[in-house]
């Protein structure tokens, strides 16, 4: 997590700053949403537990051609210790449940804000 520089600052940033920046990006997405986010694309729901950053990325990486979430995808990759590619699935996916990207982002945002408030940055 010390290698998360480059999104909003030139050098490495503390984990709390990286998480705050991710939250702020998700807030931007939800607030600037005019038409359905990513044309209403559906993604696998995930369990918001340990390892959820990789799981979130694995879900969102399957959405292509949606510029609104490209920065989020890049930021999530900084929190995930392994390389994630399209079609990859983790046990954290709720494989029988698909939700719209907009709802996925909303749920993720709510959870990340609580992690930030509780001081859980990893």
């Amino acid at each position: 997590l010390t290698c998360l520089g480059g999104f909003a600052s030139p050098g490495p940033v503390p984990p709390s700053t990286a998480l705050r920046e991710l939250i702020e990006e998700l807030v931007n997405i939800t607030q600037n949403q005019k038409a359905p986010l990513c044309n209403g694309s559906m993604v696998w729901s995930i369990n918001l537990t340990a390892g959820m950053y990789c799981a979130a990325l694995e879900s969102l990486i399957n959405v292509s051609g949606c510029s609104a979430i490209e920065k989020t995808q890049r930021m999530l990759s900084g929190f995930c210790p392994h390389k994630v590619s399209a079609g990859q699935f983790s046990s954290l996916h709720v494989r029988d449940t698909k939700i719209e990207v907009a709802q996925f982002v909303k749920d993720l945002l709510l959870h990340l804000k609580k992690l930030f408030r509780e001081g859980q940055f990893n």
Partner: antibody, heavy 120, light 112 residues
């Protein structure tokens, strides 16, 4: 309009238990934290604990551990405070409050308080 | 636990005077996320507490600008520049940085 509506006053006997409720309207309790605060007659405020209704993550002040149990029912948008083995020390006004919904920085709305009297 | 110590216990003032309430924490209340969750609440008789100041110095919406908060680390102050009758009541500082969260003992602002 955001509101927290608490249950009515209670008069209970020593040794009994009581369950107080706090129902949110105008917001979803899953989107925030609900806290409980105690105020004994003519005394200050004491934080009892809080619940994250989205995942039932609960934190207590250790001095209320065993005395207080905080729960939530998201289907009715209600948080509860159960107090057991009541003594005169538990006679107080109990408030619920919510953390504001942006960054959970502070308590922006409070319930009106529930007066609990423990007396034989 | 973080002990929050408020002084004075009682503060007699004349209307129009400045009032100052001090709150000292037994340890730093800077949260691991960098924020300092220090709040000030006012409780009037028979009412629920109401938020005045959050994160040390931010006025809550609708709070008059005669209220100001300052401080850092372990020392915090609430100032009321010109006390009005509606300001009377008990003021509490509160730290929401370290669980268990804790309130100060309260300061009663009353007419001299």
């Amino acid at each position: 309009e955001v509101q927290l509506q608490q249950s009515g006053a209670e008069l209970v006997k020593p040794g009994a238990s009581v369950k107080l409720s706090c129902t949110g309207s105008g917001f979803n309790i899953k989107d925030t934290y609900i806290h409980w605060v105690k105020q004994r007659p003519e005394q200050g405020l004491e934080w009892i604990g809080r619940i994250d209704p989205a995942n039932d993550n609960i934190k207590y002040d250790p001095k209320f551990q065993g005395k207080a149990t905080i729960t939530a029912d998201t289907s009715s948008n209600t948080a509860y405070l159960q107090l057991n083995s009541l003594t005169s020390e538990d006679t107080a006004v109990y408030y619920c409050a919510r953390s504001e919904e942006n960054w959970y920085d502070f308590f922006d709305y409070w319930g009106q308080g529930t007066t609990l009297t423990v007396s034989s | 636990d973080v002990l929050m110590t408020q002084t004075p216990l009682s503060l007699p003032v004349s209307l129009g005077d400045q009032a100052s309430i001090s709150c000292r924490s037994s340890q730093s209340i800077v949260h691991s996320n960098g924020n300092t969750y220090l709040e000030w609440y006012l409780q009037k008789p028979g009412q629920s507490p109401k938020l005045l100041i959050y994160k040390v110095s931010n006025r809550f919406s609708g709070v008059p600008d005669r209220f100001s908060g300052s401080g850092s680390g372990t020392d915090f102050t609430l100032k009321i520049s010109r006390v009005e009758a509606e300001d009377l009541g008990v003021y509490y500082c509160f730290q929401g940085s370290h669980i268990p969260y804790t309130f100060g003992g309260g300061t009663k602002l009353e007419i001299k």
